[in-house]
């Protein structure tokens, strides 16, 4: 039966019809009207953006466009003391200051309200000490100074290269090593790709350009001061000692011109390797301290930058179902942006804004969707996914009985080379047939299909002829619902060839050069790969909200849950002797994945048989789907971390934009060899074997036949 | 009762190769991740590799990487270790084991010319 079918409408309002309304030059024109001023986060600017898209998704034809507004905690520079950095001589004497602000873009030269560079909640300070240069400031970086180059931090100010990893998380390692401050700086290493001039000439990173961006480490908690609740108009705020999340030490982000000033003085040790060393003319010393002539100067911090607890607005808008208006697919993604936001969001939200106005073309034609979808536009991401966090805190209970799935929107863009998908094994089929239905918009593939040029560029590292499709992290506004909630959740975009730029993330994220022109002149000058990423996103939310059958695969979950199983065992197999010792078995999880994957082949079976004119029992394996991904849910959340309770997958504790499987595992062995008592860090592993063991069992059951 | 039995050990030049058997029963073979473990005279265990389900999920230590290969037959619910480029090293006693509680007794591997 056709996915229409339910709906009663005329054949033409399928997937095709809603498709075929995108158009690109839409998308560049929406992309062009949110990029022309700064939408930092609780800026009237921001509030007047969300006022405008209200107004228009009402007029492209939704039910109903609400504002949903929260008071969180923010923060921002002070506009009369600005931060900088200092090389101080052995009086006290400022011989060198790092720059205040961004040089403008052209044409961007008069416009007012551009933030300066700045870590956001870092506290205020003024410390001043030696430096020690901590490469990317990962775990492993400070086991190597701390363990093998006997290095101490404590005390010290550390300079370390952004990439790899979330810089909360650096944040945080540097604070655990002791350091009294911490310089955050784009290498070009990392930042500017060989053979491509810098901006406006290129997509690369200036020397005066630099990345702003939050230094939380909330672990899912939303507003640092209501974690758990909605930040609402009788909330109980925490006092500011103990909000979630907050850094303890001075923080700020500097360019590599800048960089350039403090690392050529270095003394001290030798980098270790050449992974240490960026492209720089400098050594990469990592110190303590300057070298011989320099060895009297030191490095003075300026932070006096304020948290301050202020208004943010998301915009919820509703298209409700034609049957099951009790069931929500929402499609979100943030509108608050760091400066211009060229890219990070505005390239997601203006396909986000193309989205809503073909549902909305569809429905003022008479077709309803099957099931309600909810379109977001949330705010301020960028200082911890606080809009998307507090919305869904307020809505837990609904969304927990009633939230098929979500599917993110950030920026649609990180390159132009080929698709990047991140999601729920579940998704696994439904991207699978949607990306064979679509076009490819590479050079090479003309008349190819999506699927086509995306498994050649980025094939599966495991099944041939499939491509790459990875887990879910953090770092975005899906987090609440994937790893809190427990909603079937992904995100696609359009990424960089990761083979031949090793650079992390764009060079120009986060900085005042991520303008429309940048997207227009250099990324996507026919907006062809944001047309295509808005085909995959709104094809999904089509599919999510109008196919009779969820198309969701469970076998998807088996195949991946037997993965993980293997890794996870081999990570524990590493230490044999303890393993025998302590006695610990993996018999228990390996058993339940075995059940779940016959459970979930049987109830594949069902699905393949029943009877889909009945729609009591269509309902009820549409909710046995639907329940699945909730079902790995562990109410008590993962140790220490009570926000992230999914079993399966959680941001890494050490990178919080990379996904881990069975992390609860993996967290009770990281660095086990270290631990003061082996028998509670081994006592520690069976009980986390033990709770993955009987979660995986315990989703397998809910696919059971009920009865 | 699970019962893990290993053969194949003996004794090569350096550059030699062996091929380790541990043939498995009590337990559905098919659904355990498999290891190869080993213990070099005077030294404590070191694991050597590991396998999950099939020939796709295979891990190894760094110092075997590219000339040691684990498979695993589960028509015959038995892993192999295909030992190539053999070294002085590598001369140990060689367990399989399900996990810390299900071991075999070993096969020795003595490398020595």
């Known amino acids: 039966k056709s996915s229409n079918e339910a709906t009663n409408i005329t054949p033409k309002h399928n997937m095709k019809a809603f498709l075929d309304e995108l158009k690109a030059e839409n998308i560049k024109k929406f992309l062009y009207n949110f990029t022309q001023i700064p939408h930092l986060a609780g800026t009237e600017q921001n509030f007047q953006l969300a006022k405008q898209i209200q107004s228009q998704w009402k007029e492209f034809g939704l039910d109903s466009v609400e504002l949903a507004h929260y008071d969180v905690l923010l923060s921002y520079p002070n506009k009369t003391h600005p931060n900088y950095i200092s090389i101080i001589n052995e009086d006290g004497n400022e011989i060198f200051n790092t720059s205040l602000f961004e040089p403008p873009p052209p044409g961007y030269e008069n416009v007012s309200d551009i933030v300066p560079p700045f870590s956001a909640f870092s506290p205020q300070g003024m410390p001043e000490g030696d430096l020690v240069y901590v490469n990317y400031a990962r775990t492993e970086d400070f086991f190597k100074l701390e363990r093998d180059m006997k290095i101490n931090c404590s005390g010290k100010i550390v300079i370390a290269r952004y990439g790899k990893v979330f810089r909360g998380n650096k944040v945080k390692n540097a604070q655990l090593a002791g350091a009294k401050g911490v310089i955050l700086y784009s290498d070009p290493a990392d930042y500017f790709a060989p053979g491509v001039k810098s901006y406006p000439d290129g997509w690369n990173l200036p020397g005066g350009g630099v990345q702003r961006g939050n230094i939380l480490n909330l672990n899912g908690a939303g507003d640092p001061l209501t974690p758990g609740y909605p930040a609402n108009e009788y909330a109980y705020r925490r006092g500011i000692a103990e909000a979630v999340g907050l850094p303890s030490i001075p923080v700020h982000p500097i360019g590599y011109y800048d960089a350039q000033k403090l690392l050529e003085k270095m003394g001290g040790s030798a980098p270790p390797d050449s992974s240490w060393r960026g492209s720089l003319k400098v050594p990469y010393n990592v110190g303590p301290g300057f070298t011989g002539n320099f060895s009297t100067q030191k490095v003075k911090m300026h932070i006096h930058s304020t948290n301050e607890v202020t208004r943010i607005y998301n915009v919820i808008g509703t298209l409700r179902g034609a049957v099951e208006p009790d069931r929500y697919v929402i499609l979100g993604g943030h509108r608050d942006s760091w400066v211009f936001g060229g890219i990070d969001p505005q390239s997601g939200a203006a396909v986000v804004h193309e989205i809503v106005r073909s549902f909305g073309t569809l429905k003022k034609e008479g077709w309803r969707p099957r099931r309600t979808i909810l379109f977001a536009s949330w705010d301020a991401e960028e200082f911890g996914l606080l809009g998307s966090t507090e919305w869904a805190e307020e809505n837990s209970r609904l969304l927990q009985e009633r939230g098929v799935a979500y599917i993110n929107a950030d920026s649609s863009i990180e390159g132009n080379y080929t698709l990047r998908v991140d999601c729920t094994p579940l998704m696994y089929s439904l991207v699978h047939n949607l990306t064979k239905e679509l076009k490819s918009p590479d050079e090479g593939f003309e008349g190819k299909s999506l699927y086509e040029s995306w498994t050649k560029k980025s094939p599966s590292p495991e099944f041939s002829g499939m491509p790459r499709i990875s887990k879910l992290g953090s770092g975005n506004d899906f987090e609440v619902f994937f790893q809190r909630l427990g909603i079937a959740s992904g995100r696609a975009r359009y990424t960089k060839n990761w083979e031949t730029n090793k650079f992390s993330g764009y060079p120009l994220y986060h900085s005042v050069y991520e303008t429309y022109e940048l997207v227009e002149k250099f990324y996507d000058p026919m907006f062809k790969y944001h047309l295509t990423v808005a085909q995959v996103r709104g094809g999904m939310v089509f599919e999510l909200a109008n196919s009779i059958v969820l198309p969701f695969d469970c076998r998807d979950y088996a195949v991946v849950l037997r993965k993980y199983a293997d890794k996870i065992y081999s990570i524990s197999m590493k230490h044999p002797q303890e393993m025998k010792t302590y006695s610990v078995s993996f018999d228990s999880l390996f058993s339940a994945v075995k059940n779940f994957t016959e459970i979930a082949s049987k109830f594949s079976e069902r699905l393949q048989d029943f009877d889909k004119s009945n729609p009591i029992v269509l309902r009820m394996m549409n909710d046995q789907l639907m329940f699945l991904e909730r079902a790995f849910i562990d109410p008590l959340g993962l140790p220490d971390r009570p926000f992230y309770r999914h079993v399966i997958y959680a941001p890494s504790s050490h990178n919080k934009y990379a996904g881990e499987s069975f992390p609860g595992i993996y967290d009770a062995l990281f660095d086990i060899e270290s631990k003061v008592d082996p028998s509670k860090a081994w006592g520690e592993v069976k009980r986390q074997i033990y709770v993955a063991a009987f979660t995986v069992q315990a989703a397998a059951e809910t696919l059971s036949e009920v009865a | 009762e699970v019962q893990l039995v290993e053969s194949g050990g003996g004794l090569v030049q350096p550059g030699g190769s062996l091929r380790l058997s541990c043939a498995a029963s009590g337990f559905t073979f098919s659904t355990y991740a498999m290891s190869w473990v080993r213990q070099a005279p005077g030294k404590g265990l070191e694991w050597v590799s590991s396998i999950g389900e099939n020939d796709r999920t295979t891990y190894y230590v760094d110092s075997v990487k590219g000339r040691f290969t684990i498979s695993r037959d589960n028509s015959k619910s038995t892993l192999y270790l295909q030992m190539n480029s053999l070294r002085a090293e590598d001369t140990a006693v060689y367990y399989c084991?399900?996990?810390?509680?299900?071991w075999g007794q070993g096969t020795l591997v003595t490398v020595s010319s």
């Open positions: 084991a399900k996990d810390g509680v299900h």
